[in-house]
Interface confidence: low
Amino acid sequence: MIPPPEKVRMNSVNFKNILQWEVPAFPKTNLTFTAQYESYRSFQDHCKRTASTQCDFSHLSKYGDYTVRVRAELADEHSEWVNVTFCPVEDTIIGPPEMQIESLAESLHLRFSAPQIENEPETWTLKNIYDSWAYRVQYWKNGTNEKFQVVSPYDSEVLRNLEPWTTYCIQVQGFLLDQNRTGEWSEPICERTGNDEITPS
C-alpha cells in the first residue's frame, strides 16, 4: 500500500500557483508523483510521474474554481489522491508592491508599482485583475510606535506636513477596496525629510 503525499498545499503568490507536498514516510525512496487538475469535469495530468515535490499550475485561468490533486506512485502501484480546492483570483496571495520615495522639503513623494503577474504580458499587474485595487500606506517616525495609514487608488501619493529633518519609515501593501482584502506589506523603507525654509546663500 503506497501512502499518499503529505502536507499538500497550494502556494500561490501573484498568480504563480505552485502545488507543494512532502514525500510520505515509506521505505522505498524512488517514489514518483502525478498531479492533475479538473477541467471540464475530467482530470488532466499536469505533472506526470515526477520526482519533484511541487507542480506549477500557473497556467490555470485566474477565474476558475479548481480541484487539484496529487498522488504517489511506485511502479504499477499508487496511493489515494489528495485533493486541494483552489480559486486563483480568490486564493492567491497579493505580494508587496514596489515603492520609490523622493524627499522634497517637509513631504515625501511616493511612487508605487503593483506586483506583476506570472504568465502574462510584461505590463500586466494585479491592477489589471482587481478593479478595486488600491494601495495602503503605513508610515511612522523612525524609533516610535505610532503609525499612520493612508489609502490611495493612485500610483503615487504625497505625505505632507511632516516634521523637517526627520526620518520616517514607510511600507505599502495592495488592498482590494470591495473585498477588504489585504496583501503583503513591503519591507519598510526609511527616508529623511528636508526643510522648506529658504536658507541664505
Epitope: R9, C87, E90, D91, N180, T182, E184, W185, P188
Partner: nanobody, 126 residues
C-alpha cells in the same frame, strides 16, 4: 527574520483563567493570519484559535469554543488568547504562529504557518 514571542503561561486550577500574549515584529504584525497552536506531551499539534488580522474572521477548535477568545491589537503588534474555564486537558505548550494569509474559508493547518514563537507552558491542575 520574523520574531514571535509568547507570554502569559503558567499554572492554574481547573476553572481558572489565563491570558496569553504574542508579540510580533513589525514585519508580520499586519499580515493576514495569526493563530494559537497547542501541543500536549505525546499528542499532535492542535490549532485552537485563528484570527485574520483585518478582524474579519476568527476560527476556534471545537474543544475550546465558548471558553477561549482570540483577539488582537495591531497598534501594539500583539495577539491575545483569553482562556476561561480551563480544564486539565488544556494543559499543553501553547505556540503563537503566523503567515501571510489565511485560507479563504477555513482555519489554517499548523504546517501552513511558517513563523513560530518558542511557546509558553500552560498547566491546569484539577
Amino acid at each position: 527574520q520574523v520574531q514571535l514571542q509568547e507570554s502569559g503561561g503558567g499554572s492554574v486550577q481547573a476553572g481558572g483563567s489565563l491570558r496569553l500574549s504574542c508579540t510580533a515584529s513589525r514585519y508580520i504584525a499586519l499580515n493576514a493570519c495569526m493563530a494559537w497552536i497547542r501541543q500536549a506531551p505525546g499528542s499532535e499539534r492542535e490549532v485552537v484559535a485563528t484570527i485574520v488580522t483585518d478582524g474579519s474572521r476568527t476560527y476556534y477548535a471545537d474543544s475550546v469554543k465558548g471558553r477561549f477568545t482570540i483577539s488582537q491589537d495591531n497598534a501594539k503588534n500583539t495577539m491575545y488568547l483569553q482562556m476561561n474555564g480551563l480544564k486539565p486537558e488544556d494543559t499543553a505548550m501553547y505556540y503563537c504562529a503566523a503567515d501571510r494569509r489565511c485560507p479563504v474559508s477555513r482555519a489554517p493547518y499548523e504546517y501552513e504557518l511558517r513563523y513560530w514563537g518558542q511557546g509558553t507552558q500552560v498547566t491546569v491542575s484539577s
